[in-house]
């Protein structure tokens, strides 16, 4: 099955933005939203944001989770608000992957 081709005038979605690329903004606008988790020296760093251009997120969003990084992508306004990327687990839940700043 072929990849879906981006439309000539692609729809832009509002996404939650949390992380190093967000500056002082808490949202961004793009063709895809994402929620990611990376392990930095054993510490869980969660980020959320958007891919402004379809191609930008195309490869990233298709990358399967690894022990050190995971990305989940979606399309829709604020669709990444309640998404928390999860590392692959060996058949059990892993509390250490919940978002660091969610109560």
């Amino acid at each position: 099955m072929e990849d879906e081709k981006p439309k000539v005038n692609p729809k832009l979605y509002m996404c939650v933005c949390e992380g190093l690329s967000c500056g002082n903004e808490d949202h961004c606008e793009g063709q895809q939203c994402f929620s990611s988790l990376s392990i930095n020296d054993g510490f869980h760093v969660y980020q959320k944001g958007c891919f402004q251009v379809y191609e930008q997120g195309k490869m990233t969003c298709k990358t399967p989770p690894s022990p050190g990084q995971a990305v989940e992508c979606c399309q829709g306004d604020w669709c990444n608000r309640n998404i928390t990327a999860q590392l692959p687990t060996k058949g059990k839940s892993f509390p250490g992957t919940q978002n660091f700043h969610l109560e």
Epitope: L20, S93, F94, P95
Partner: antibody, heavy 118, light 106 residues
Framework: EVQLVESGGGLVQPGGSLRLSCAAS????????MYWIRQAPGKGLEWVSS????????YYADSVKGRFTISRDNSKNTVYLQMNSLRAEDTAVYYC???????????WGQGTLVTVSS | DIQMTQSPSSLSASVGDRVTITCKAS??????LNWFQQKPGKAPKLLIY???SLQTGVPSRFSGSGSGTDFTLTISSLQPEDFATYYC????????FGQGTKVEIK
């Protein structure tokens, strides 16, 4: 109640070895990353090492890389720090720590003192 | 590695004073910053995580703020038990602590 109890500290000569242990209780040990942090006498805190849930991924500060090895035994709820080629500058209180599901370094043990001196 | 610079390195204050400690990162760390309190001979105790979230059981006189490179820990009304050393800690990349700020009795 979460408890972390370090042991294994003591006096060792430069170039010597020591193995620290951290016995954990009060939580499902195998679900959590674990950490070692140290503090030289009268100085600040320094992150030393981290280990993931199954022990397959380990991380080290540059100052200890190649000399220290972190490991864990989930059946014993214990994390270890094997310290080789010890130097005077490794003299410190070594703390074991863990994160809660959403908060890094939320819990710490009481620490164990390692003194490297001839 | 990211450098964390705390200021001041020490300060003298009285009970009831408002105390502010700052931490500056050498590069953007977003909100990936914690604050710890340490008393002599004791392990550090977590006060604030993710820059501004109060750890359970910590009195509300403690608060944190900041994002990017500049962060602040504020004690709104200093209590006798607050005299201690305070450390910031970033986990954005190459985890590092600030050098500490000792809060002493004036």
């Amino acid at each position: 109640e979460v408890q972390l109890v370090e042991s294994g500290g003591g006096l060792v000569q430069p170039g010597g070895s020591l193995r620290l242990s951290c016995a954990a209780s009060g939580f499902t040990f195998s679900n959590y990353y674990m950490y070692w942090i140290r503090q030289a006498p009268g100085k600040g805190l320094e992150w030393v090492s981290s280990i993931n849930t199954d022990g397959g991924s380990t991380y080290y500060a540059d100052s200890v890389k190649g000399r220290f090895t972190i490991s864990r035994d989930n059946s014993k709820n214990t994390v270890y720090l094997q310290m080789n080629s010890l130097r005077a500058e490794d003299t410190a209180v070594y703390y074991c720590a863990k994160s809660t599901p959403n908060i890094p370094l939320a819990y710490w043990g009481q620490g164990t003192l390692v003194t490297v001196s001839s | 590695d990211i450098q964390m610079t705390q200021s001041p390195s020490s300060l003298s204050a009285s009970v009831g004073d408002r105390v502010t400690i700052t931490c500056k990162a050498s590069q953007n760390i977003y909100k990936y910053l914690n604050w710890f309190q340490q008393k002599p001979g004791k392990a550090p105790k977590l006060l604030i995580y993710y820059s501004n979230s109060l750890q359970t059981g910590v009195p509300s006189r403690f608060s944190g703020s900041g994002s990017g490179t500049d962060f602040t820990l504020t004690i709104s009304s200093l209590q006798p038990e607050d005299f201690a050393t305070y450390y910031c800690f970033q986990y954005s990349s190459g985890p590092t602590f600030g050098q500490g700020t000792k809060v002493e009795i004036k």
